[in-house]
């Protein structure tokens, strides 16, 4: 899947655009907003009625090297008594992000953008019931 | 620090860190995931902490369309379909990386940008602060 060109007619390609070889693009991986703080609600992963755990992977040939994934703890949801209610379902909520992959081919190194699907947490849903005729 | 695995026969010139600027292939390697959460699942309607999805569009960014979740209620939906204010609907937020055209309007020059998105909502037990 290619990155779309700027489609709006009022966008004229500025003279200041850097020269880029065909079939590739220039990517600055110094992240904009890198130091922006994230204030998440505390411990929502254990306070949720559909609680989750986190797993982490780390790959030095991926940028970012660290990717954290959520995994729902239960099939059902936790009720007011703290017990699992299997009449409801804990389901994962997912979000795409981009990563840069470094590839070694012989002695040359190339870089590839990759879309990664990250599970960010879980939510409790009413199940879809399929009636069999 | 960490050393990057490399072919032992190659000259030892490669930096263990990623360079600041790289040339990348225009094709994005991915499983063709569905970027419209409304089409991929109806969890946003079936959840006990339902949310609405708002389209955020920016032609200077890739992906240009990002869907933002906003919880519909402060409380959660109980078995009777009513809002229970003893529980809280809270957004699940995630930092993601996107591409920002830099310089602006340039077709093939980008910089990574970190943005915070609300992906959905979950129902949590509230933190109760007791006032002395």
């Amino acid at each position: 899947r290619k990155i779309p060109k700027v489609g709006h007619t009022f966008f004229q390609k500025p003279e200041s655009c850097p020269p880029v070889p065909g079939g590739s693009m220039k990517l600055d991986i110094g992240i904009i907003n890198e130091n922006q703080r994230v204030s998440m609600s505390r411990n929502i992963e254990s306070r949720s009625t559909s609680p989750w755990n986190y797993t982490v992977t780390w790959d030095p040939n991926r940028y970012p090297s660290e990717v954290v994934q959520a995994q729902c703890r239960n099939l059902g949801c936790i009720n007011a008594q703290g017990k699992e209610d299997i009449s409801m379902n804990s389901v994962p909520i997912q979000q795409e992000t981009l990563v840069v992959r470094r590839k070694h081919q012989g002695c040359s190194v190339s870089f590839q953008l990759e879309k990664v699907l990250v599970t960010v947490g879980c939510t409790c849903v009413t199940p879809v019931i399929h009636h069999v005729q | 620090g960490i050393t990057i695995p490399r072919n032992p026969g190659c000259p030892n010139s490669e930096d263990k860190n990623f360079p600041r600027t790289v040339m990348v292939n225009l094709n994005i390697h991915n499983r063709n995931t569905n970027t419209n959460p409304k089409r991929s699942s109806d969890y946003y309607n079936r959840s006990t902490s339902p949310w609405n999805l708002h389209r955020n569009e920016d032609p200077e960014r890739y992906p240009s369309v990002i869907w933002e979740a906003k919880c519909r209620h402060l409380g959660c939906i109980n078995a009777d379909g009513n809002v229970d204010y003893h529980m809280n609907s809270v957004p699940i937020q995630q930092e993601i990386l996107v591409l920002r055209r830099e310089p602006p309007h340039c077709p093939n020059s980008f910089r990574l940008e970190k943005i915070l998105v609300s992906v959905g909502c979950t129902c949590v037990t509230p933190i109760v602060h007791h006032v002395a």
């Epitope: 890198e34 130091n35 998440m40 505390r42 992963e45 986190y54 660290e66 954290v68 | -």
Partner: nanobody, 119 residues
Framework: EVQLVESGGGLVQAGGSLRLSCAVS????????MGWFRQAPGKEREIVAR???????AYAEFVKGRFTVSRENTKNTVYLQMNSLNIEDTAVYYC?????????????WGQGTQVTVSS
């Protein structure tokens, strides 16, 4: 200059437990995410666990509930409690610190502590 010093490694029998500690000095400990990594002979370094500034913890798949990472901000220390150790857990264990973002690396590393699990 930020310094990380690991301790608590040693020789333990399979099925046993160890508690690793990592003391951090020279920086603002409470603002760092902390990671535990390990490197076995002839293998690449791999992440074991990480803990962010506000508590959430994440573990590598192979941990399977056997290890617990925790931090004590008042003591500038991070811990790795390792239970049900097996021979495959033999490695040098490293503690690392970095800016608390998913997209930041680990800028500071300890020298490592050897963990040997015998049968």
């Amino acid at each position: 200059e930020v310094q990380l010093v690991e301790s608590g490694g040693g020789l333990v029998q399979a099925g046993g437990s160890l508690r690793l500690s990592c003391a951090v000095s020279g920086g603002t400990f409470s603002t760092y995410k902390m990671g535990w990594f390990r490197q076995a002979p002839g293998k690449e370094r791999e992440i074991v666990a990480r803990i962010s500034t506000n508590g959430p913890t994440a573990y590598a798949e192979f941990v399977k509930g056997r290890f617990t990472v925790s931090r004590e901000n008042t003591k500038n220390t991070v811990y790795l409690q390792m239970n049900s150790l097996n021979i495959e857990d033999t490695a040098v264990y490293y503690c690392a610190a970095g800016y608390d973002s998913l997209f930041a690396g680990y800028d500071y590393w300890g020298q490592g502590t050897q963990v040997t699990v015998s049968s």
